[in-house]
Interface confidence: medium
Amino acid sequence: IQIPEEYEGHHVMEPPVITEQSPRRLVVFPTDDISLKCEASGKPEVQFRWTRDGVHFKPKEELGVTVYQSPHSGSFTITGNNSNFAQRFQGIYRCFASNKLGTAMSHEIRLMAEGAPKWPKETVKPVEVEEGESVVLPCNPPPSAEPLRIYWMNSKILHIKQDERVTMGQNGNLYFANVLTSDNHSDYICHAHFPGTRTIIQKEPIDLRVKATNSMIDRKPRLLFPTNSSSHLVALQGQPLVLECIAEGFPTPTIKWLRPSGPMPADRVTYQNHNKTLQLLKVGEEDDGEYRCLAENSLGSARHAYYVTVEAA
């Protein structure tokens, strides 16, 4: 039997279903507009309402801002007409889409206002070190609610070459397992890229001064990161897990990863940054246990034990 489309359209009812919504965390910067997204399907046509911090929120009734609300949609954009406006709209938002058959609810959308990132003003003293010694050049980017990417460059905007000896850690610091006279430069610059504000900021240049020596003394490995012998961390099921070990010493130590509590899940493990970083994709219950990094050179070794507890996300 063929049922005409128009017949079906009039008689088949559908409860509301949220089809599109903003991410759970939304960071708004001072020069941005605020856009909150909520789309839903349903028959008869759904009606939308919003709450902020549990209280009914009507974007169109907000004073001193321009609001664009899409027709047949719960999505809206608030145009910022002053540098303080994002502050006013911080909070936890929720969208409700209703028709005769019921109500669908979006997840909680946490809207955070953040200042455009700036590095604290500081005077950077030259870093003096003897050839063969280790050194850490700090980056310390400003705190940010959004993820940021760190790069080390020189004043000619050329990336600092990284290898087994020279490594940038997850924290943004630049680690030298041992320095060579060729590392002697006055313009090590840490750049922080904040995708949310389309902003790149740079730290004051660091002047690394390497004093030449006639004989470089061999040193057994020592961990620069982490500095303690063991650490405990919680990994969430289904999320990635990143473990890191950075060592100093001369000759340059190599890093190995072991799993005393069982086999390494080879299909889900990748090693990056010249083996200094172990990344486990999509953590599962079976990944619970100890992961050990071993830094070795001809004079000896240093180790760190990560004790990982897997919890439900």
Epitope: F29, Q87, R88, I201
Partner: antibody, heavy 118, light 113 residues
């Protein structure tokens, strides 16, 4: 590092207009609202208004609405303030300053001294 | 508009002395959603631009000596210099950035005896 460069002095005749500039460097120009502040000799500070360099949106102190016009040139990372129908009351130092919607005005230009005299 | 009142208008102290200056606003500067007071203190030395000392009423700007302390909440605020140095000779302004138009106090002039 962040710098806001303003020319030192402007001498203008009563009734004329003047366009003050503020050249920004060392940060992403479109990420901060630019503020303008007036200081008459021996007097306090008065907020004139602000402009969002990313979209040119402005917000003025009512007192200066008919006096000042704020604009930006994104290509040169420069903010401008045009002052019209100048009188002796407009003789002052005018500062541009950065405010990022969060931490107050933490970077200031050196100021342009405007003297209105025939 | 929010009116900012500063007192005293001037004061003269000896090096090493403790100084407090007051700033009162005609409306509360406490922003409920993040519990921060939108008040800043600036220092302006003769012939120079203002320099930010304190924001959010009590947070010291990086690079500002720890002898400068901001305190208060709502409508009453204080800037304290624990042990005045000769280089602290300046005008000190408070400013609210809670509501438009932003407004400044008339300033406190600090002189050294």
């Amino acid at each position: 590092q962040v710098q806001l460069q303003q020319p030192g002095d402007e001498l203008v005749k009563p009734g004329a207009s003047v366009k003050l500039s503020c050249k920004a460097s060392g940060y992403t120009f479109t990420s901060y609202w630019m503020q303008w502040v007036k200081q008459r000799p021996g007097q306090g500070l008065e907020w004139i208004g602000e402009i969002n360099p990313s979209n040119g949106r402005t917000n003025y102190n009512e007192m200066f609405k008919s006096k000042a016009t704020l604009t930006v040139d994104k290509s040169s990372s420069t903010a401008y303030m045009q002052l019209s129908s100048l009188t002796s009351e407009d003789s002052a130092v005018y500062y541009c300053a950065l405010y990022d919607g969060y931490y107050a005005m933490d970077y200031w230009g050196q100021g342009t001294s405007v003297t209105v005299s025939s | 508009d929010i009116v900012m009142s500063q007192s005293p208008s001037s004061l003269a102290v000896s090096v090493g002395e403790k100084v407090t200056m007051s700033c009162k606003s005609s409306q509360s500067l406490l922003y409920s959603s993040n519990q921060k007071n939108y008040l800043a203190w600036y220092q302006q030395k003769p012939g120079q631009s203002p320099k930010l000392l304190i924001y959010w009423a009590s947070t010291r700007e990086s690079g500002v000596p720890d002898r400068f302390t901001g305190s208060g909440s709502g409508t009453d605020f204080t800037l304290t210099i624990s042990s005045v140095k000769a280089e602290d000779l300046a005008l000190y302004y408070c400013q609210q950035y809670h509501s438009y138009p932003f407004t400044f106090g008339s300033g406190t002039k600090l002189e050294i005896k």
